[in-house]
Interface confidence: low
Amino acid sequence: YFGKLESKLSVIRNLNDQVLFIDQGNRPLFEDMTDSDCRDNAPRTIFIISMYKDSQPRGMAVTISVKCEKISTLSCENKIISFKEMNPPDNIKDTKSDIIFFQRSVPGHDNKMQFESSSYEGYFLACEKERDLFKLILKKEDELGDRSIMFTVQNED
């Protein structure tokens, strides 16, 4: 069971300092941006991280949403990352959900975060280069210290 607590506005970056944004096709991508670019591209660069109380504490349970014309929430259905047009629900009556991730700091690096899927244990949000795009994907943790699954989260409130 997950019960919604508070939400905060955040900018999410990979460890190459590329900014996560949602493009016109609703795809989550990373791109080099100055602070000015990041502001100019809002709200596509501003993510609503909603925190949830977890009946089985396993880390900070969160959803990641973005509000452009409508609110879309990040999902990892079938281990595929996509934004689905939906509000983060107030309650989720299950021990896992495609939209719930466990946000945890990287041991020894309090400012670096990992997001593990609640549906797919051992799978984390990651940045992966595909041709000329840097995409947000779900991947299994292959090795300790894998930088692709580490992010910084900067609160904008």
Epitope: E77, N78, K79, I80, I81, S82, K96, S119, Y120, E121, G122, Y123, I137, L138, K139, K140, E141, D142
Partner: antibody
Framework: EVQLQESGPGLVTPSQTLSLTCTVS??????????WTWIRQHPGKGLEWIGY???????YYNPSLKSRLTISVDTSKNQFSLKLSSVAAADTAVYYC?????????????WGQGTLVTVSS | EIVLTQSPGTLSLSPGERATLSCRGS???????LAWYQQKPGQAPRLLIY???IRATGIPDRFSGSGSGTDFTLTISRLEPEDFAVYYC?????????FGGGTKVEIK
């Protein structure tokens, strides 16, 4: 190379519970990253995904079977199991266990040879 | 649920000919999350293609996949005797995971 082998009774009485076990060899079920899957094929028909499980016990079920379905895992025996309750003739099928390839998406690179389960009185 | 429709149901061809198999989704399989399998009588399916066009390990290059959105194609450039089998497409974009009904490639 990973190998999967299904085992269990080939004949089940209507309204009873169908129970199958898949034994994995050539690799550890707890190595992580892979979801262990059950798929069935009705005689002369196409394939139907039943559900899958992670080594930790986390499961994902086909909604059409969810109310009757339990998939479990025993890492000490390197096995995972399927239980389908209240079976009917429509559950007669070849049941396959399989391993998903890992990474993004759910598709299967290793399969058992399949076992035919007939539901009949 | 995404329903996959395969056509034709049966394809009668001779060895050496080109086979073109179609798989159509009831809605878009976005980002191309589609796989193809080959199944021979009495055997389990064998993964051929995933990600629309990526050949699985050990699959010969006469097998190729293409398509996007709702329309996907598996092409066998020159049929070998061992290629006569049933072929299934499978989507892993939406839940539940679903398969097409299959296309049988038989010897003419």
């Amino acid at each position: 190379e990973v190998q999967l082998q299904e085992s269990g009774p080939g004949l089940v009485t209507p309204s009873q519970t169908l129970s199958l076990t898949c034994t994995v060899s050539g690799g550890s079920i707890s190595s992580g990253g892979h979801y262990w899957t059950w798929i069935r094929q009705h005689p002369g028909k196409g394939l139907e995904w039943i559900g899958y499980i992670y080594y930790s016990g986390s499961t994902y079920y086909n909604p059409s079977l969810k109310s009757r379905l339990t998939i479990s895992v025993d890492t000490s025996k390197n096995q995972f199991s399927l239980k389908l309750s209240s079976v009917a003739a429509a559950d007669t099928a070849v049941y396959y266990c399989a391993r998903d390839r890992g990474g993004s998406g759910s598709y299967w690179d290793y399969w058992g040879q399949g076992t035919l389960v007939t539901v009949s009185s | 649920e995404i329903v996959l429709t395969q056509s034709p149901g049966t394809l009668s061809l001779s060895p050496g000919e080109r086979a073109t198999l179609s798989c159509r989704g009831s809605r878009s399989v976005s980002s191309g999350y589609l796989a193809w399998y080959q199944q021979k009588p009495g055997q389990a399916p064998r993964l051929l293609i995933y990600g629309v066009s990526i050949r699985a390990t050990g699959i010969p290059d006469r097998f190729s996949g293409s398509g996007s959105g709702t329309d996907f194609t598996l092409t066998i450039s020159r049929l070998e005797p061992e290629d006569f089998a049933v072929y299934y497409c499978q989507q892993y974009h939406g839940s539940p995971l679903t398969f097409g009904g299959g296309t049988k490639v038989e010897i003419k």
